[in-house]
């Protein structure tokens, strides 16, 4: 079957996100991938969106993330825009209104995005073949 345009958008956004490091990409998020054996694909997308939403809601105007220079501030704003787009697209792909995120495990945002990118690329390779 045809790859969803949203999936392509997600991969492009993840590529952009993982290329850039900011003051906040080393901060931690809930690692939903640590124990996702019995989780459906849609639940995984929904939970990933929830984690991203929690992150940017908490850190959007966080002074630690805003930085001391204009360039750091600009990069942080771009990071937030990318995260919001990613959240929006994952939520659309999931088609679920809400999903619990209860894991205790943590990972850095950077590692979380890399793991998500791997999952999305695998999904893309399956649907495009």
């Amino acid at each position: 079957h045809k790859c969803d345009i949203t999936l392509q958008e997600i991969i492009k956004t993840l590529n952009s996100l993982t290329e850039q490091k900011t003051l906040c990409t080393e901060l931690t998020v809930t690692d939903i991938f640590a124990a996702s054996k019995n989780t459906t694909e849609k639940e995984t997308f929904c939970r990933a969106a929830t984690v991203l939403r929690q992150f940017y809601s908490h850190h959007e105007k966080d002074t630690r993330c805003l930085g001391a220079t204009a360039q750091q501030f600009h990069r942080h704003k771009q990071l937030i825009r990318f995260l919001k787009r990613l959240d929006r697209n994952l939520w659309g792909l999931a088609g679920l209104n809400s999903c619990p995120v209860k894991e205790a495990n943590q990972s850095t945002l950077e590692n979380f995005l890399e793991r998500l990118k791997t999952i999305m690329r695998e999904k893309y390779s399956k649907c495009s073949s």
Epitope: E9, I80, R81, K84, R88, G92, N97
Partner: antibody, heavy 120, light 107 residues
Framework: QVQLVESGGGVVQPGRSLRLSCAAS????????MHWVRQAPGKGLEWVAV????????YYADSVKGRFTTSRDNSKNTLYLQMNSLRAEDTAVYYC?????????????WGQGTMVTVSS | AIQLTQSPSSLSASVGDRVTITCRTS??????LAWYQQNPGKAPKLLIY???SLESGVPSRFSGSGSGTDFTLTISSLQPEDFATYYC?????????FGQGTRLEIK
């Protein structure tokens, strides 16, 4: 100061083409998605198109799909809208707009607009 | 495409009044909604994004609320410069769409 300036509007006959330009200053164009929004005389706002910050994605309103193309030259800090097969219903003020600083696909900086009149 | 319905389409009020404009979407968009103000012959101006976040430089008398399908823009105490047309816009998915507008006039 952050600014967008459109140009290229005018009167054109139905079926003809026109290219609008939008010159950006005061910010790095390559960091932002850019949109075109239009407003017919006495009417509301209608979104026309978006091009992602790096030019990798473009989306269009159904009303212009296949006729309009947006492009960008980040080295010249300029956005373009190529309008082909123009129709009377394309008559409007055309605005270019920058995506929001904190959210994608909202418009925090707008140009002053350029009027396009399609008439025989 | 997601449709947006604003109400009322026009509204008469006086300086100092509290005014509320509503925007309803044809499907759930969580908080992916923005509000704009437009004066005649001018470009629109962003007021609110993410349903309730106030854009930098916008007076605090403007506020937004809601999520899902029902949203409101409130002006707590109307000032003379607030008489204009207001638009809501969804950015949950392409195509981006606007409400039909609410014209706010002096009573």
């Amino acid at each position: 100061q952050v600014q967008l300036v459109e140009s290229g509007g005018g009167v054109v006959q139905p079926g003809r083409s026109l290219r609008l330009s939008c010159a950006a200053s005061g910010f790095t164009l390559s960091s932002f998605g850019m949109h075109w929004v239009r407003q017919a005389p006495g009417k509301g706002l209608e979104w026309v198109a978006v091009i992602w910050y790096d030019g990798s994605n473009e989306y269009y309103a159904d009303s212009v799909k296949g006729r309009f193309t947006t492009s960008r030259d980040n080295s010249k800090n300029t956005l373009y809208l190529q309008m082909n097969s123009l129709r009377a219903e394309d008559t409007a003020v055309y605005y270019c707009a920058r995506e929001g600083s904190w959210s994608p696909d909202i418009f925090d900086i707008w140009g002053q607009g350029t009027m396009v009149t399609v008439s025989s | 495409a997601i449709q947006l319905t604003q109400s009322p389409s026009s509204l008469s009020a006086s300086v100092g009044d509290r005014v509320t404009i509503t925007c309803r979407t044809s499907q759930g968009i969580r908080s992916a909604l923005a509000w704009y103000q437009q004066n005649p012959g001018k470009a629109p101006k962003l007021l609110i994004y993410d349903a309730s976040s106030l854009e930098s430089g916008v007076p605090s008398r403007f506020s937004g609320s809601g999520s899902g399908t029902d949203f409101t823009l409130t002006i707590s105490s109307l000032q003379p410069e607030d008489f204009a047309t207001y638009y809501c816009q969804q950015f949950n998915s392409y195509p981006v769409t606007f409400g039909q507008g609410t014209r706010l006039e002096i009573k």
